[in-house]
Amino acid sequence: CDLPQTHSLGNRRALILLAQMGRISPFSCLKDRHDFGLPQEEFDGNQFQKTQAISVLHEMIQQTFNLFSTEDSSAAWEQSLLEKFSTELYQQLNNLEACVIQEVGMEETPLMNEDSILAVRKYFQRITLYLTEKKYSPCAWEVVRAEIMRSLSFSTNLQKILRRKD
């Protein structure tokens, strides 16, 4: 499974698109900054076996895809960039699904560490709650865009684990 290579490229493309999606200066939104409690320890791949790393990566990307597929998101971003970004995420999800199938000898490995998956889900729940409380304002979306860039950057740590354990 050549996930590490394809996923790194896809992740880089997603980050570039997310950067291009910025519509307002982050400096004008400093008052809206928020600590979402990114579960950084969940991206320390040393605690994971390969399938579990794949599973956490998928969770991160699926939740990001969910977030950017809402009607509120459609209203907030430039459509062609949003579509390209979403397509990139979808492609990564497909790659990760295929990887589970292609990996030999992973059958007895648990697919997940439930605590890690729940930590990622709660993180995205906090993001969704923040957007709701801020009534999906342009600054709120800008803060979230910056946060997702940060979380996608962190997910590269998990990709390194996959590369190391190939």
Epitope: E59, Q62, F65
Partner: antibody, heavy 126, light 110 residues
Framework: EVQLLESGAEVKRPGSSVRVSCRAS????????ISWVRQAPGQGLEWMGR????????NYAQNFRGRITITADKSPLTAYLELSSLRFEDTAVYYC???????????????????WGQGSLVTVSS | EIVLTQSPGTLSLSPGEGATLSCRAS???????LTWYQQKPGQSPRLLIY???SRATGVPDRFSGGGSGTDFTLTISRLEPEDFAVFYC???????????FGQGTKVEIK
């Protein structure tokens, strides 16, 4: 919880087309695929294809390519199945089905059907 | 293309007995992507087991799934009257996404 509501029963002539709709309500996400699965009388289940409403991306089973079109609206979240060049053997109950966003981990979510419509009977008869 | 073959076609048992249903794949299937459904007459299928062995919400613990590679089983430890139905196994393969169902096993009252 997701509810899937399909359109009513149809009677069609051989060679014609049918369009079945499936409206989703509840905790829906356009970022999860909606599939169509059919069941001929007294027979098993057969996956026909799926659509990802968020992007309009479709995947079709080999058996139906060239005859099947799946489309979707994002608001309200609705999927449509169109099957053309109908034959007698297309007489079946057509189900729409979707994964669950609650399945942990999400990587299993799209590999299964957690929610099913009530089914729409399509009868092909001359 | 993967073919799933379920056996037996029909299983005649009494309430209280145990049942073992088999699902055999024509090639290796990830157990993580193996799912079981129950369908009663006139009803839509219901998700029972996913990921090979995880029970769906509300499914009693008398249902269990197991197996790997090409051989998978659904076990019902003690049949209750409401368990009699047709059971289907289903696998997922990607890319491109393909969902395959077995032909079903009918568990009927003896």
């Amino acid at each position: 919880e997701v509810q899937l509501l399909e359109s009513g029963a149809e009677v069609k002539r051989p060679g014609s087309s049918v369009r079945v709709s499936c409206r989703a309500s509840g905790d829906t996400f356009s970022s999860y695929p909606i599939s169509w699965v059919r069941q001929a009388p007294g027979q098993g289940l057969e996956w026909m294809g799926r659509i990802l409403p968020a992007l309009g991306v479709t995947n079709y089973a080999q058996n139906f390519r060239g005859r099947i079109t799946i489309t979707a609206d994002k608001s309200p979240l609705t999927a449509y199945l169109e099957l053309s060049s109908l034959r007698f053997e297309d007489t079946a109950v057509y189900y729409c089905a979707s994964p669950s966003a609650d399945i942990i981990p999400s990587i299993l979510g799209t590999t299964l059907f957690a929610f099913w419509g009530q089914g729409s009977l399509v009868t092909v008869s001359s | 293309e993967i073919v799933l073959t379920q056996s037996p076609g029909t299983l005649s048992l009494s309430p209280g007995e145990g049942a073992t249903l088999s699902c055999r794949a024509s090639q290796n299937v990830s157990r993580h992507y193996l799912t079981w459904y129950q369908q009663k007459p006139g009803q839509s299928p219901r998700l029972l087991i996913y990921g090979g062995s995880s029970r769906a919400t509300g499914v009693p613990d008398r249902f269990s799934g197991g197996g790997s590679g090409t051989d998978f089983t659904l076990t019902i430890s003690r049949l209750e009257p409401e368990d009699f139905a047709v059971f289907y196994c289903q696998s997922y393969h990607s890319p491109p996404p393909v969902y395959t169902f077995g032909q079903g096993t009918k568990v009927e009252i003896k």
